[in-house]
C-alpha cells in the first residue's frame, strides 16, 4: 500500500506512476504488492 507520507513526498506525481515504480520493484524483489 502507498503510505500517506510517500503520497505527500511525491505530491504532484500521478498515483499510477507510484504504482508503476512499486510494481517494477516488485518484479525484481518479489515483494508482495497487496
Amino acid at each position: 500500500a502507498v503510505s500517506e507520507h510517500q503520497l505527500l513526498h511525491d505530491k504532484g506525481k500521478s498515483i499510477q506512476d507510484l504504482r508503476r515504480r512499486f510494481f517494477l520493484h516488485h518484479l525484481i524483489a518479489e515483494i508482495h504488492t497487496a
Epitope: F23, L24, L27
Partner: antibody, heavy 118, light 116 residues
Framework: QVQLVESGGGVVQPGRSLRLSCAAS????????MSWVRQAPGKGLEWVAT????????YYPDSVKGRFTISRDNSKNTLYLQMNSLRAEDTAVYYC???????????WGQGTLVTVSS | QLVLTQSPSASASLGASVKLTCTLS???????IEWYQQQPEKGPKYLMD???????STGDGIPDRFSGSSSGAERYLTISSLQSEDEADYYC?????????????FGGGTKLTVLG
Amino acid sequence: QVQLVESGGGVVQPGRSLRLSCAASGFTFSSYGMSWVRQAPGKGLEWVATISSGGSYTYYPDSVKGRFTISRDNSKNTLYLQMNSLRAEDTAVYYCARQTTMTYFAYWGQGTLVTVSS
Amino acid sequence: QLVLTQSPSASASLGASVKLTCTLSSQHSTYTIEWYQQQPEKGPKYLMDLKQDGSHSTGDGIPDRFSGSSSGAERYLTISSLQSEDEADYYCGVGDTIKEQFVYVFGGGTKLTVLG
C-alpha cells in the same frame, strides 16, 4: 551487453501447442522480471505475459490467460512461453523483453515467428 | 478502459524536426507512458518513459535528438535533426496494476517517413 535470443517458432496447426525459449546473456538473469510481447504481421505490439525475477508471480492479458504459461529457469538463463490451444490469431512475431528498475520493456530480442495455420 | 491513440502516419524532411503524439484516454491523463522505436525488420527499441509533467528518462544509447513533453492527456515525442535511420514505426505504451493484476497496452503506432 544485454542479449536476448528467441527460438522455437514455426508453423503449427490450430489447437496444437508450442514452446518458445529466450536465451539471455550479458546480465544477471535472475535479478529481473521478464516479458513476452507479440506482433501480428503488419500490426502493432501486444503484451502477452510477464514473470517476476524468481518466477513466483506471473501476469497475462485476458486474450491469452488460461492458454499461455510464462516460466523461467534461472540456472539456464532462459525464459519460456508455453502456448496451448493455439489459434490463427496467435500468429505473430514473439519478442522477449527485460525490465529495468525504471521501465517494463527496456531491452528486446529480435523475435521468433509463430504461424498458426492448417 | 486504458487506451492510447496515435496517428497512423507522419512525415518530415531530412534534418527537420517532427512531433509525434500519443493521447491517453481522458480518465488516465496523469499516467506515465513509454515510447518505443521499431525500425524496419527489427525488434522494438525502448526510447524513454514520459511523465505527466513532461520529465523523461531515456534508454541506453538514445541520442538527445529524441525528447519528450506532455500537455494534459497528450504525450509527445519530438525528434530533431531527422536522419534517414529515424524512419520507423513509433509506439507508445502504458502499464498499470489494478487489484494485483498487471495490464499493459500499446498505441496503434505511427509510421514515420523521412523525406528527401
